[in-house]
Amino acid sequence: KNLKSPQKVEVDIIDDNFILRWNRSDESVGNVTFSFDYQKTGMDNWIKLSGCQNITSTKCNFSSLKLNVYEEIKLRIRAEKENTSSWYEVDSFTPFRKAQIGPPEVHLEAEDKAIVIHISPGTKDSVMWALDGLSFTYSLVIWKNSSGVEERIENIYSRHKIYKLSPETTYCLKVKAALLTSWKIGVYSPVHCIKTTVENELPPPENIEVSVQNQNYVLKWDYTYANMTFQVQWLHAFLKRNPGNHLYKWKQIPDCENVKTTQCVFPQNVFQKGIYLLRVQASDGNNTSFWSEEIKFDTEIQAFLLPPVFNIRSLSDSFHIYIGAPKQSGNTPVIQDYPLIYEIIFWENTSNAERKIIEKKTDVTVPNLKPLTVYCVKARAHTMDEKLNKSSVFSDAVCEKTKPGNTSK
């Protein structure tokens, strides 16, 4: 009896794993084996596919074959017993095009109100993604184990921190990778669950801000309790995309180690030009807080985005504010070569109720003021560029009294 060729051959490629599956054509014939050949583009001869010779099952793995993943290949299969079937040719394919991204590896670290997620490709030193390893982005689905209500988070990098969670609560999540450059979406990782810890008696420091004074950076933050020590760490922001890089390591700012105030001053030359992440941790000697939320710190903008300088012309029912370029040390104005938007906060000196105006113009009217009343004003600048979303610190407050009621404009 003539052996029939196997049919319906499927090629599954996940990362560097190449799997072939096929259907037997004749289930009634026993002791049949199957063998594959392959042919590279531009070649006439067929080569035996190692790992897929004389296979008794309907599945084989040819991952050991060192292929150029960008080069088209063709496969053929036949059945063998005493005689052999005719060859069945599989449509040619390019491994890279056919490949799926496998499930990433996930490592979780729990805080009381946050989870740190470390993601790395499932296949280390993958040949398939060798040119795209740094282009992976990830998305995740997270849910509270007790409720199952899912939240999706897209376009995250190899390290991501989810905040505003509840203490002592189990959260579950799964992660998948994507290569947007190649329109590839990967397979989800297994579900990972972790329980957030009991609430830390020491909250993390908050409202971290960087400003420039003379040739120094001044880093300030808020903290709930007194008599604490703080440490500050920094990281190159680009490394967040690639924790596999051996440079990925939070480092101490030497002048900000074990400081006893809620600020520290360090020379500008500590950082070369670039974008950094900063974080702060508090300790009372016995206990340690979790790390603060990280702030992005761009030396280029930070060096120039100083608080605006302004003059106030007082009328009976309004202030006219004229915003000028901030002064550097030496009283030279700073040239801002990117568009700014100004946030002006004002309040009655005897009250805490603040009002806010946001303006692109450098001359601003603050309306609806009461005559003969002291008002205070402070201002800060924001960049309008979304990519460089940065704010200066607020200027010092300037307080002025409005004129009597009948002042003409």
Epitope: A110, V116, T197, N200, H246
Partner: antibody, heavy 123, light 107 residues
Framework: QVQLVQSGAEVKKPGASVKVSCKAS????????MNWVRQRPGQGLEWIGK????????HFNQKFRDRVTLTVDKSTSTVYMELSSLRSEDTAVYYC????????????????WGQGTLVTVSS | DIQMTQSPSSLSASVGDRVTITCKSS??????LAWYQQKPGNAPKLLIS???TLESGVPSRFSGSGSGKDYTLTISSLQPEDFATYYC?????????FGQGTKLEIK
């Protein structure tokens, strides 16, 4: 697979120094902290310190700070622990143990251990 | 330094028994707790990290629980190969510290 292979047993006189090596294989050596732990005869475990093989940053148990030196040879993926001014109470098995990834935000458990090196201090 | 107090210091049990070992820390350690098993002449072996996460290859009869300052290792049904000394360790604050150990012996 991950392996940590330590140097052989040592006998030293009081006041001398000992240098124990720990050769790592099966993982990216510079991506994980390497810790040292000791165990005195019939006693529990005591953490000595740890080193980052990528840049040699160290952290020590205050108790050992003045007498212990941790070093790295990246070319051979080997970490060394040297203990000076030895006394009889330093007689112990010394273990190297892999800690967490350097990129982690917080410290991690010690997941792989060397086989241990017995250091005997005796006059 | 954070003190780790393990109890009991020794325990006699039979194959098939359910066994519980507890570990108390002098400060809150936020689940940064590991359990190790050590057999005579061998290095410790990590069983559980993060207070509850079973390491790969460790039998499911081992489980960890607890939070804050109080943590527990449970062996649901003792097997002959489980007779050993067990240590807890905190890795929340440096210096990392270990419990004094619990020796699990055959009754």
């Amino acid at each position: 697979q991950v392996q940590l292979v330590q140097s052989g047993a040592e006998v030293k006189k009081p006041g001398a120094s000992v240098k124990v090596s720990c050769k790592a294989s099966g993982y990216t050596f510079t991506s994980y902290w390497m810790n040292w732990v000791r165990q005195r005869p019939g006693q529990g475990l005591e953490w000595i310190g740890k080193i980052d093989p990528s840049d040699s940053e160290t952290h020590f148990n205050q108790k050992f700070r003045d007498r212990v030196t941790l070093t790295v040879d990246k070319s051979t993926s080997t970490v060394y622990m040297e203990l000076s001014s030895l006394r009889s109470e330093d007689t112990a098995v010394y273990y190297c143990a892999r800690g967490g990834r350097i990129s982690f935000d917080y410290d991690a458990a010690l997941d792989y251990w060397g086989q241990g090196t017995l250091v005997t201090v005796s006059s | 330094d954070i003190q780790m107090t393990q109890s009991p210091s020794s325990l006699s049990a039979s194959v098939g028994d359910r066994v519980t070992i507890t570990c108390k820390s002098s400060e809150v350690i936020y689940n940064r707790l590991a359990w190790y098993q050590q057999k005579p002449g061998n290095a410790p072996k990590l069983l559980i990290s993060g207070a509850t996460t079973l390491e790969s290859g460790v039998p499911s009869r081992f489980s960890g629980s607890g939070s804050g300052k109080d943590y527990t290792l449970t062996i649901s049904s003792l097997q002959p190969e489980d007779f050993a000394t067990y240590y807890c360790q905190q890795y929340w604050n440096k210096p990392f510290t270990f419990g004094q150990g619990t020796k699990l012996e055959i009754k």
